[in-house]
Structures are given as C-alpha cells and as structure tokens.
C-alpha cells in the first residue's frame, strides 16, 4: 500500500521542515518540576514500542508506522543501560532499584545496593537504598504507585521496599529462617516502609490472611488471603490515616477519587496481577488509564506537588508468554494512560519520564507491506516452505516441534490473541534482553535526558529535577514547594 | 562477577552526578555547522549497539557494558522510525534516500520518491530526489563516501545515484530494456552524477570492462571486471580531474593521503565487498578507520568545509548471515573509525551524526552472567534440556534441525567465528528488522537530533546545520563556508 | 451470580437447520469469551466454538469438525450467545452446553456452564 | 491442533483409595489444564484450573500436578460422593478436552 500523498517528496520535506521548526523551537526550562511523574512499561524495549505503534495505528485506520504514540511526543531521548550489577541481562528487581533509587543492585533484589545477595536475608541491613519516592514524600510531596501487576511486584516495591528476594510477597513467601532473621515480606513493607497516598493495582491476596475469601472470587480457593501471621494489612493501613479509604472495585474507584474526605486511597483490583486489558471485565476492574487519573486527581490536591509510578507491568507478562498479541494491546493501553496524565497535567510543572526497564528477545522483521498487520505474516515462505510471521522471539514457550519439524502457521492462526509466536529456543517463559532501552521526557528539566547514559540516571534526573535529597541545593527557580 | 566499588552506592551516585553536571553543562551552539560527517551502521540496531559496547569493553579486559562506545559520548540522540513508503521493515536502498535525501522511498529503489517503482526504470525520471551530498558539492564543499561494502552499494548509492533497482551493480546487472529506456547502473552513476572528491570501498569489479582481470586476483576469472559496454570507469574518472589518483590497496591508500598533488582519490580495495573485518589482509586493504583517516586528511583541506559518508556496511551482512561475531566486530571496527574521526575533527565545526538504516531481528538475552562472553551460553538448560546461546536471532540461516531436534552447542562452539546462532524461523538470509534506531549526535546545531523523528529527518537536519538547500536562510552564525 | 440459560434444542431431521440460544446474566456480557461445548449420548465433552470478547473483536474459533457448518455469534444487546447449525447430522445429536470463560492466571478456563439443550438429528 | 491424551478410560476403586488419573498432550500446554467432574444428567463442574489451583468448596481431597506435556489429577482419599467421570481440558491453545475417565466404586 503506497499512499498516494508520500510518493510526493514536498509531504517529507514538508513534515520535516515542520519537524526542525519544532526542534528549534524547543527551549530547555530553567525551573524546577513541582511534580514527578515516571511512566515504566515493563519489558518495553525499542522492538515492543514500533509495534504497539503500528498496532495502534492500525486501530484508528491507519497504516501504522506514521502514526504517534504519546510517549514519541515527548521531545527529549535517551538511552538506558539496564544490566545489573551481576548481570548483564537483568530483572525486574534490579533494576527498579536503579531508575528508582539511583543505585544499582543484584538480580532480584529491590531497594538494596550490590552488597546485598539475592536471598540472603542477612545482607539486607545497612544496604538499603533510598527511592526518589520516598524522598519526594519526605520533601512534603503526596506519592502514589500504579500498576497493572500486584502492587508488591517487583518495579513498583522499588519505590518502598528494601528485600533480598523479589518473590517474599507476602510472608508464605518468606522461609521461616528469613523472618526469623528480621526479614519482612513486600507487602508488609508496602503498609510500613513509609506513608504512600495511593496505592493501585493487584495483589489483594498478599495482605489478608490464609482462609480469607476473596471478594470478587469468594468460590476459587486459591484466590484467596496467604497471611500466615494472621495479619489483616488493608486493616492496618486503614487505621494509620483517618482519610483512608481502600477499594476492589472500579465503581468504587471511580468514587473515593472524587471524594474530597479520601486523603489516602488503596485499591487493589485482582488477588495477584490485574488481568490483561483484554480479559479485563470493565464493570469489575479499572484500566490503567482510570487509575492512572483516579491517583491524578488524588495527588494534584497538595498544592506541594507530588511524585508518581504508573506501570505498565504486564507488557513483559506478554512478551514471557511469548503472546505477542498480549504484550502489544498492554502497551497500547500503558500509552493510552501516559496521553491521559499528559491532558490532566501541565508540562510548565510536571516532569513526565517513560520507560522501560529493559526488553524483551523479540523481533519484527520479514519484510510486510506498510499496513500489514502486525501479527499477520511475512510475504513469501522459508526454506521449509512454511509461513512465518513478522513477529517472532528468540526464546520462549512458543517453540514447538510437530513430527520433528517447524510448524506451519496461518494468518488466522498468527492473528488470535492466544498465539505463540515461535522461537529459536524452547523456554518456559521467554526471557529479558539486554539493549539499551529509551527514556522519553517532557517537563522541567527534560533536556537532562540525553545520550547514553546508565539506568540509575534516571532517578537523579527525577530528584534533580524537583531539588530532592541529594540535589536540595539545586539552584531551579521556582524552587520545588514554593507554590504552597 | 560483582565489581566491589560497584556494591558501595556512592559508586553510582558520583558517577550519576558527574552525568548530570555534564547535562547540565551541554550548551546548543547557534553556530553553522561547516563540516557534517555520517556514520551509517548498516543493519546496526540497539541491540547490536549494546552486544558491540559489551564486546568492544571485554576486549579491553573490563566486564563490558559499564565502557563506552565512542558513539555513546555523542551527547544528544533521538529514535529514527526506519519504515519505507511500501514495507513495514524496510531495505538499505530505501533508507538511504530517506537519511541521505530526506524523502522516504519505495523497498529497493534508491535516490528516488516513492512515486518511482522497484524495477520500472521508466518510473524514474522526474522522480529523483537531491542529496545532502550533492548539495553540499554544490555549495563548494568537499565531498567523500567511505564504506567496506562495494561503493555502488545501496547505502554508499544513496548519496549520488537515482535507481529503481539498488542491485543494478555494473550494466552487467541491468536489463537489456532497461538500459534501452535510459537506465544507468549504479557504477556509471558514481562517476557522472556528480563530482566526489574522495570514494573510498570496495567494487572493482563493476568499474572496468568484462575480462578485466582483477589486479588483487587476477586468476580468479569471477572477480574480474563485469561491464558490458567495454568502458574503464576509473579511467574515464581519473580524466575528470587533473588531481585525480585511484588505489587499489592500502599502500597506495596510505600515500596517496598524503600526497599534497591529489585533489580527488578512488580507492577500491576488492573486487565486490570489502573482507570482514577478522578476513582482512592488514597489508592490502585497509580498516574503516584507515579508510576514514585518508579521507578526512584529503577533505579537510577544503576551507568551505567538507560532507563525508562512512559506513560500516556488513554490520549487516553478518547479521544476515546469522553470525553474530562478525556483526559485533564489523560494529567495533565502525566504531573505531567514529572515534578516529572524533580526533581528526572539531566539534565546534562539524556536526557529526552517527545512525542505523534500519535493524536486525537479532537478540540478546537468556540473563547471563556480567562479565560473560557476548557469544557464550545462556546460564541453565532449555526445555529440550540442551544449552542454548544468549545470542538469537528470529529468523535466518541459522535455524537446523538434526534428528528431528534443535542442535545442542557448547561455549566452544559458540564462540567461534563460523558460528551460526539459531533462529526461530529458517531463512538463506536473516531479516531486518522494523523497529526505530537510534541517531546520535554531535556538534553545531546538534541539539536538533531530539525524539522520535522519521528517519528523513536526519537529512534535513544535515541541510540545515551546515546552511544548504532549502535551508540557505538558515539564520546561523557563523554562516557555512565564512571561513574561505 | 453467574448464570447461563440455553434453548433452541429439540428434534431435527438431518441436513436441516437449527440455531441454539444462550442468555447470560451477571456479569459484563461484552468482557468475556464464551463458547458451545456438545457431549453425545454416552460420549465424551466436546467443544465446537469460540467467540472472544469486545477488547478482541469478537473473534471466532472452530473446531474441525463443524468448521463451515456451523456459526457462533453473539447479541450483546440482549446479553445472547447463538450457534447457527446448518447441515445437520444424525452424529450432531448431544447436548449443547453454553460455557463462558474466566480469566485465571492468563488462561481462558472454561468455568461457568448452562444446564444445556438437547439436540436429536434423526429421521 | 493439541489433542490430550486422558488415562484410564475407566477405572474401579474402593472407598478410601489414592485414585490418579493423567493427561498428556500432544505438545507442551504450559501448565494450562483444568479438571471437571461430571455427574449423570448435569454439566461439568469446574475442580482445578491451571493444574493445581482449587476452586473454593472442591474438597482438599482433590488436587492435580505437572508441567509441560504431562499432568496427573489425584483424589488422596475416594468417597463415595466421586463417583463421576472425569476430564481434563486443555486450554493453552483453543480447547481440548481428555476422552473422560469413569470412576466406579468397586
């Protein structure tokens, strides 16, 4: 498909006239950020945003590629360098714990510096690091987590938690050595760590206790509460703030948002992860673009600012499934929220960052024709006379061998939500990559993201930005909080 | 392998510092740019960017991705979206009328709008489209194209030649009609389209008439000229200009560069492509970097300044063949010539952009060990309970199966040269890929390079930054060529 | 509480046609895959067909055997799920249950079923 | 398409046995199977989904294992309330269910 109106070069050099005038245009801000705003698309390598691009797109009739997601409407780039102190493809942990926290750490490990070991429970003293959150919080801003995952994952815990294993979700997680020695579990943390205004996401399991039904699945047993210390979480964190309130539900959601009494809100939508937006029940559980607004609305109260987390965490669930479909449809709606935040904020006042934590082995090629769908296949057949699809992952749970041979795929087959798509290795779960990532920034202090730089940068653009611990002497006018 | 200062946080702190002192110091210069350089990594994404980083840094007996590669220290980048006119994932012919013309093209035609169709030469007139080259050439500076494929390859063809057919090499390689209806091939348009002072590659053998023997292999029947219409290009070449040298190996390269008298130098080093990188014989042909060298010796001499082309051509050629080694030293070899000319030149007058034509469905993954070779095992077992390498590609020739099974390998294997790493999909030639690639830059007007941009961007910015065509009302001081 | 309600069963002669109902309430109708699952006399569970939700457009799936005779659609207005039999065969004869998924842990399980309708093809 | 393989086709047992029933498919459904006990004359009901989770009110007695291609259901202690017949379902790719296990009581 070739349009009509690009086979005349005036359309590309008129677009990239326009494109240098907007360049040229761009004026670095001199002023500090009164709010901080990070966007994580978890496992959003560079290969999962053309893609979600072109898929979204195509959703609005579009040939795809031309189109702009909100995050490339952000007018600075960088690059991250993601591998951890002990690894050179990382995890979910570590690396929280550097676009958080400023600091990084060892695979699997959240909140602490490499000097803690994963599992090691006696490494955690005197080795925790602290997030731009909570030094946000500490500056008298109001802070807010949002996720598509339970709220004690992995790269949201980067933002309270300090644990030696990623996977101590709640204290059955925890061996029995472990609490003995003091350590506590992320959801434990999650309530004690420090005071967190709002809390969204999954992970309702982790704070009731074994045999604690769950409410929207009260007939599934292994839905329900996992506390084997008896503790009731939600009941604790309820009690510390009169202006608490905590939700399951969208309707609920939708309400505490607009109550003026909700000083502290916490909603917790699934037992574990929240369900893909695809499987997601729109009377049950929010998008990730209403809690994204739901916690806007929140935290633009305090006329201090705030700091917030959205996570766009089950992008990287997709791609581990090796479900292409799944990954892409998360990050389209991850981008659908960074777009929400940016019509509900100023970027006279809001520093805006989005990215990813580090990729994913997956792969676009084959050479389609513009407006091929991206799940559809490559023209033309492989050497074993088969069809393949653009879309495919270097290792994964999509490899599969039929009578000692690849198998053939169909573009109906390669088109549905539940496909594979195949690869090189037979994995479980398709495995993390090590690129460079991108960082995307709008707002004061924008213009800092630059280049190539190490993953810890970003959480020192973040307190730079708004003049935090360590950078209080940051010398912005207005000076961040002068606005109270 | 845990560095110890990396476990102390002030590790990271410092050097996040140091990073944001060095933002907060980078200054847009307002100055015209007098001299602009390209570096063009063919097929070289981020995911080869950070493999290379990683190789290049174990070479030098560091663990790899906490070095720098010299295109890291550019200070600005931004994402190219590579896509062409007709293709999702697009080709090197394609690409290069967008970064070399800044006007996206149809797969395989070069030098032309998309209004020109693949292999219809009666497509091509009024369809051509200007490169910065040329019009850097017209407004008197000096000119060069450097690059270890054939000269007459798709990207170098970019800069100077107008074909609906980037594989029409010599006339040998265009069809009878075609050539009847007024179609040059590629070799011819090097030498006429306009004058370039410095050529520098590979492809002989598409300059002098078929039984020409080559003079690096003059018993190899195959490497001998292939023209059909009996001219000797180099010779009618050398007859254009007084100052005019041509050079078939590096001895003659290396004086030749030299050489006050020479105002012009063709040096074509092997028949077709140059040899990889870990092939070459160091006595005959020279590197990249050498190649890079000579030219900037011979265009800095031009007081109105220079444009200079240098690609590291078979970056992708590894790719394609699956060999991840000779990709990643192709790339290190590329970057070796960056950092060259980073010493030869000043960024206070040359804009210096350095870019991928497009991507390679190539990964690297599997959570390996820091400090681990980038050709190594994956840690653990596959679910066929085989080993299996961080490396992968998702399609290509590297797929086999032996006994109905996927190939066990060993680090031994791996590591070799030869070494064919497995892909999901069997193809005789491994795919581009379609997501972005990163731009950095460095010099006047540098700061431009910002966002998501399309890749016909890079050519404007070119334009602009040293005041040529459209952008001669650049506004910049001082103004381009002041210098004469 | 999740329930499903099918109709449309009854006796049939073959190559004729017969189109089967299923009414669901409480719960979103539009957020949740549903299929038909048949089970012959004395046999074995079967499932014949798939409609996904709104977020994937209403996708439909088949199994082999009835691919081309029969249609799975669905009326979100009315909360509905149908399956349209045409050529029918005596070893179409079963019971027709309507199913809906549930979403755990990714999967697509099928875990609410109607009571079911019974269909007899014969002459 | 995956096609599961379900074993015995039948089997008797006396109150209080350990009774193990096992699905294979024909490629790895990434612990994605479930099992359903059916009774005369009424719809399946759903006892385990994604191998081993339980749903509420199905009695611990019931439990299922594995991965890949092989997955095993298990009742640790029969009663005379389970007799039924018993499928598995995969669901990673579409659906397929096991040919059905009845289970008597000897």
């Known amino acids: 498909i070739i349009p009509v109106e690009e086979e005349n070069p005036d359309f590309w050099n008129r677009q990239a006239a326009e494109a240098l005038g907007a360049a040229k245009k761009l004026q670095p801000a001199q002023t500090a950020a009164k709010n901080l705003i990070i966007f994580l698309g978890d496992g959003m390598g560079v290969s999962t945003v053309t893609a979600a691009r072109i898929l979204k797109g195509q959703k609005k009739d579009k040939l795809g590629p031309e189109t702009f997601l909100a995050m490339d409407r952000f007018p600075y780039v960088a690059l991250s360098k993601t591998y951890s102190v002990d690894k050179h493809v990382p995890d979910s942990g570590a690396t929280a714990t550097a676009y958080l926290c400023g600091v990084k750490g060892n695979f699997q490990t959240i909140g602490l510096s490499a000097a803690a070991r994963f599992n090691q429970c006696n490494t955690t003293r005197g080795n925790e690091v602290i997030s731009v959150m909570n030094r946000a919080k500490k500056a008298g801003k109001s802070v807010g987590v949002v996720t598509t995952t339970r709220v004690q994952h992995a790269s949201p815990a980067g933002a309270y938690a300090h644990t030696v294993n990623r996977n101590w979700y709640s204290d059955a997680d925890v061996p029995a050595s472990a609490r003995q020695e003091g350590c506590q579990d992320i959801a434990t943390q999650l309530i004690s760590n420090m005071d967190i205004d709002v809390i969204l996401g999954g992970g309702r399991k982790y704070m009731f206790p074994m045999g604690t039904p769950d409410p929207e699945y009260p007939d599934d047993y292994s839905q329900g509460g996992t506390r084997l210390d008896g503790k009731n979480l939600v009941q604790e964190w309820l009690a510390k703030h009169q202006g608490a309130r905590y939700v399951w539900n969208r309707t609920e959601l939708l309400q505490a948002s607009l109550d003026p009494s909700v000083t502290h809100l916490m909603g917790l939508f699934e037992p574990g992860d929240m369900k893909y937006e695809i499987h997601r029940d729109s009377t049950l559980d929010p998008s990730l673009m209403e809690m994204t607004e739901a916690a806007l609305l929140l935290l633009s109260r305090n006329p201090r600012g705030f700091f917030l987390f959205v996570e766009g965490g089950r992008i990287d669930h997709g791609h581990h499934e090796s479900r292409a479909y799944r990954a892409l449809t998360e990050t389209i709606m991850f981008d659908d929220a960074i777009e929400r935040a940016g019509q509900l904020t100023s970027e006279e006042d809001t520093l805006s960052l989005v990215t990813a934590d580090h990729s994913h082995v997956f792969s676009f090629g084959g050479y389609p024709l513009r407006g091929s769908s991206i799940f559809g296949l490559a023209p033309g057949k492989a050497r074993d006379r088969k069809a393949y699809t653009v879309l495919l992952y270097g290792n994964g749970p999509g490899y599969v061998l039929k009578d000692g041979a690849r198998p053939d795929v169909t573009e109906s087959e390669s088109g549905s939500p539940e496909y594979r798509q195949q690869s090189a290795v037979p994995l479980d779960g398709e495995t993390h990559a090590g690129e460079d990532v991108a960082v995307f920034a709008r707002g004061p202090q924008a213009h800092l993201v630059h280049g190539v730089q190490e993953q810890t940068f970003i959480a020192h653009v973040m307190a730079f930005a708004a003049c935090l611990e360590p950078y209080t002497a940051c010398d912005l006018a207005p000076r961040a909080g002068t606005t109270d | 392998i845990i560095p110890v200062e990396e476990e102390n946080p002030d590790f990271w702190n410092r050097q996040a510092a140091e990073a944001l002192g060095a933002a907060k110091k980078l200054q847009p210069a307002q100055t015209a740019a007098k001299n602009l350089i390209i570096f063009l990594g063919d097929g070289m994404g981020v995911s080869t960017v950070t493999a290379a980083r990683i190789l290049k840094g174990q070479k030098k007996d560091k663990l790899g991705p906490e070095t720098f590669l010299a295109m890291d220290r550019f200070p600005y980048v931004a994402l190219s979206k590579t896509y062409s006119v007709d293709k999702h994932v697009p080709d090197s012919g394609a690409t290069a009328t967008a970064y070399l013309c800044g006007v996206k093209g149809n797969f395989q035609t070069i030098g032309l709008s998309a209004a020109a169709r693949f292999n219809q030469c009666n497509t091509t007139r009024g369809n051509e489209v200007i490169s910065v080259m040329n019009r850097a050439k017209k407004a008197g500076k000096s000119v060069g194209v450097v690059t270890t494929t054939r000269v007459q390859h798709a990207s170098p063809a970019g800069a100077y030649a107008h074909t609906v057919n980037r594989n029409w090499y010599s006339d040998a390689d265009v069809p009878a009609s075609a050539r009847q209806e007024g179609c040059q091939d590629i070799a011819t348009q090097l030498i006429s389209n306009m004058d370039i002072d410095v050529i520098l590659g590979g492809g002989r053998k598409y300059m002098f008439p078929m039984g020409t023997p080559d003079p690096e292999y003059p018993d190899d029947y195959s490497q001998g000229g292939t023209r059909l219409d009996g001219k000797n290009l180099v010779q009618e070449w050398l007859a254009k200009h007084q100052g005019a040298r041509y050079v078939w190996n590096r001895t003659e390269l290396l004086q030749a560069s030299l050489d006050p008298s020479v105002t012009h130098l063709m040096g074509l080093f092997e028949p077709g492509d140059m040899k990889y990188e870990i092939h070459r014989d160091s006595t005959l042909d020279p590197s990249l970097m050498e190649m890079t060298e000579a030219a900037l010796l011979l265009l800095s001499r031009n007081p109105r300044g220079f444009f200079l082309f240098v690609e590291g051509g078979r970056i992708d050629h590894g790719h394609h063949e699956s060999r991840a080694y000779r990709a990643l030293t192709e790339t290190i070899m590329f970057d070796d010539a960056i950092e060259r000319a980073g010493q030869l030149t000043s960024e206070e007058d040359t804009l210096s952009l350095v870019t991928a034509d497009h991507s390679h469905v190539f990964s690297f993954g599997g959570y390996p060990l820091r400090g681990s070779s980038i050709f190594g095992l994956a840690p653990g077992k596959a679910r066929d309970r085989k080993a299996y390498t961080v490396l992968l590609y998702g399609n290509g020739p590297g797929y086999v199966l032996k006994d109905g099974a996927r190939p066990d390998v060993t680090e031994s294997e791996s590591g070799s040269p030869e070494y064919r790493q497995q892909s999901a999909v069997p193809l005789d030639g491994e795919t581009h890929a379609g997501e972005d690639v990163a731009v950095f830059a460095r010099g006047p007007q540098a700061h431009l390079v910002h966002g998501v941009q399309e890749q016909t961007f890079i050519a404007h910015v070119m334009a602009f930054a040293a005041c040529l065509e459209p952008y001669t009302a650049c506004d910049l001081a001082p103004r381009a060529g002041t210098t004469d | 509480e999740v329930q499903l309600v099918e109709s449309g069963g009854g006796l049939v002669q073959p190559g004729r046609s017969l189109r089967l109902s299923c009414t669901a309430s409480g719960f979103t109708f539009t957020d949740y895959y549903m299929s038909w699952v048949r089970q012959a006399p004395g046999k074995g569970l079967e499932w014949l067909a798939l409609i996904r939700n709104k977020a994937t457009g209403y996708t439909t799936e088949y199994t082999a055997s009835v691919k081309g005779r029969f249609t799975i659609s669905r009326d979100n207005s009315k909360n509905s799920l149908y399956l349209q039999m045409n050529s029918l065969k005596t070893e179409d004869t079963a019971v027709y249950y309507c199913a809906r998924a549930s979403f755990y842990y990714d999967g697509k399980v099928l875990a609410y079923w109607g009571q079911g309708t019974l269909v007899t093809v014969s002459s | 398409d995956t096609q599961m393989t379900q074993s015995p086709s039948s089997l008797s047992a006396s109150v209080g046995d350990r009774v193990t029933i096992t699905c294979q498919a024909s490629?790895?459904?990434?612990?994605?199977i479930a099992w359903y006990q059916q009774k005369p004359g009424k719809a399946p009901k759903l006892l385990i989904h994604y191998t081993s989770s339980l749903q509420s009110g199905v009695p611990s007695r019931f439990s299922g294992s594995g991965s890949g291609r092989d997955y095993t259901f298990t009742i640790s202690s029969l009663q005379p309330e389970d007799i039924a017949t018993y499928y598995c379902l995969q669901y990673d790719n579409l659906y397929t269910f096991g040919q059905g296990t009845k289970l008597e009581i000897k």
């Open positions: 490629q790895d459904i990434n612990k994605y």
